[in-house]
């Protein structure tokens, strides 16, 4: 796993994040875990990064992810509302120059090395649909969320807003 030391190399200068001229409204490091308190970890294997969902040993350090939050318009013609609203999008980067990507063809979540501006596949609409949990909806594929399947992250189709509280798409963020 990357551990904290790798992530501490981050500075504001490295993350001037401008997606088509838009800077994040806030950024911070947090560990990511599932609704059932399994940790999301990242490992370098055969020159590519793998993402795991696993129970950590008692004193094992949690991997941290840099979350960058962006404001985006939520057009009224999409929302059905009378006026345009705002939504919060997030990118997730566990180590420098690598971001979580939605691979909609394979229904998978992958770590890709890429440069700014980041592709749409790296952006996820942030929901908090259930107490202190969040969900990540693909910007490129509305109704499809990052979820847990067979101890890996995968893309999961959610059919209705009632199913947004399904445990396998709920995650917890912790700064400690």
């Amino acid at each position: 796993a990357f551990g904290i030391s790798g992530v501490q190399k981050y500075t504001r200068a490295l993350h001037d994040s401008s997606i088509t001229g838009i800077s994040p409204i806030t950024e911070y490091l947090a560990s990511l875990s599932t609704y059932n308190d399994q940790s999301i970890t990242f490992a370098l294997e055969d020159e590519s990064y793998e993402i795991y969902v696993e129970d950590l040993k008692k004193d094992e350090k949690k991997d941290k992810v840099l979350l960058s939050y962006y404001e985006s318009q939520h057009p009224s013609n999409e929302s059905g509302d009378g006026v345009d609203g705002k939504m919060l999008m997030v990118t997730l980067s566990p180590t420098k120059d690598f971001w979580l990507h939605a691979n909609n063809k394979e229904h998978s979540v992958e770590l890709h090395k890429c440069e700014k501006p980041l592709p749409d596949q790296a952006f996820f609409v942030l929901h908090n649909m259930h107490s202190n949990c969040v969900s990540f909806e693909c910007k490129t594929d509305p109704g499809v969320f990052i979820g847990v399947k067979d101890n890996h992250l995968a893309l999961i189709k959610v059919d209705s807003s009632e199913n947004l509280c399904t445990e396998n798409i709920l995650f917890k963020l912790s700064e400690t």
């Epitope: 806030t26 009378g82 939504m87 908090n128 259930h130 202190n132 009632e162």
Partner: antibody
Framework: QVQLQESGPGLVKPSETLSLTCTVS????????VHWIRLPPGKGLEWIGV???????DYNSALMSRVTISKDNSKSQVSLKLSSVTAADTAVYYC???????????????WGQGTLVTVSS | DIQMTQSPSSLSASVGDRVTITCLAS??????LAWYQQKPGKSPKLLIY???RLADGVPSRFSGSGSGTDFTLTISSLQPEDFATYYC?????????FGQGTKVEIK
């Protein structure tokens, strides 16, 4: 434009249930969370609870055993029920909408005008 | 629950003064903090969200700073219409809690 309007009885007897309705327009309850907040006389704002776009609710720990927030998306209405009220529940009650689509991180830019509820026999 | 401690609880200031109100969270809340202004008989008005972002229609004399546990609301040059009570609110974890309020009065 976005509007919220609280309604309900202005006077409730001790031990009874306070029932308020928040009727919204200009947005869909399937897209945004709605909060209930109150302002007791001479005190500060107190968060009561929220009903989220997906329908789940969260409540103030001190009120949790007495409070229920529900909604009817098709009627664009959110309801607040607070049971076993006492004089300490006398307050102006507000409903307010989330800033962000489907999450509460951005606070509430849209508020109703508030309704005063007095608990007295 | 996360406790939000505002200080001072009240202050007296003159038009044109620079005013600073602080809010301390009992645990980290990242930058998920909002500031509201409330006048007697009126609904609260969102001033700042995400700790530093100015809400729509709010004058630029209002600004917010901070992250983690320590936050500040600054009014760079107090205007007559700014005399009111100000509240912070954390939106990091439910239950979403308010500070106890800071009343800004005319000196």
């Amino acid at each position: 434009q976005v509007q919220l309007q609280e309604s309900g009885p202005g006077l409730v007897k001790p031990s009874e249930t306070l029932s308020l309705t928040c009727t919204v327009s200009g947005f869909s309850l399937t897209n945004y969370g709605v909060h209930w907040i109150r302002l007791p006389p001479g005190k500060g704002l107190e968060w009561i609870g929220v009903i989220r776009a997906g329908g789940s609710s969260d409540y103030n720990s001190a009120l949790m055993s007495r409070v229920t927030i529900s909604k009817d998306n098709s009627k664009s209405q959110v309801s607040l029920k607070l049971s076993s009220v006492t004089a300490a529940d006398t307050a102006v009650y507000y409903c307010a909408r989330d800033h962000y689509f489907s999450n509460s991180y951005g606070g509430s830019p849209y508020w109703g005008q508030g309704t005063l509820v007095t608990v007295s026999s | 629950d996360i406790q939000m401690t505002q200080s001072p609880s009240s202050l007296s200031a003159s038009v044109g003064d620079r005013v600073t109100i602080t809010c301390l969270a009992s645990q980290t809340i990242a930058t998920w903090l909002a500031w509201y202004q409330q006048k007697p008989g009126k609904s609260p008005k969102l001033l700042i969200y995400a700790a530093t972002r100015l809400a729509d229609g709010v004058p630029s004399r209002f600004s917010g700073s901070g992250s983690g546990t320590d936050f500040t609301l600054t009014i760079s040059s107090l205007q007559p219409e700014d005399f009111a009570t100000y509240y912070c609110q954390q939106l990091y974890n439910t239950p979403y809690t308010f500070g106890q309020g800071t009343k800004v009065e005319i000196k």
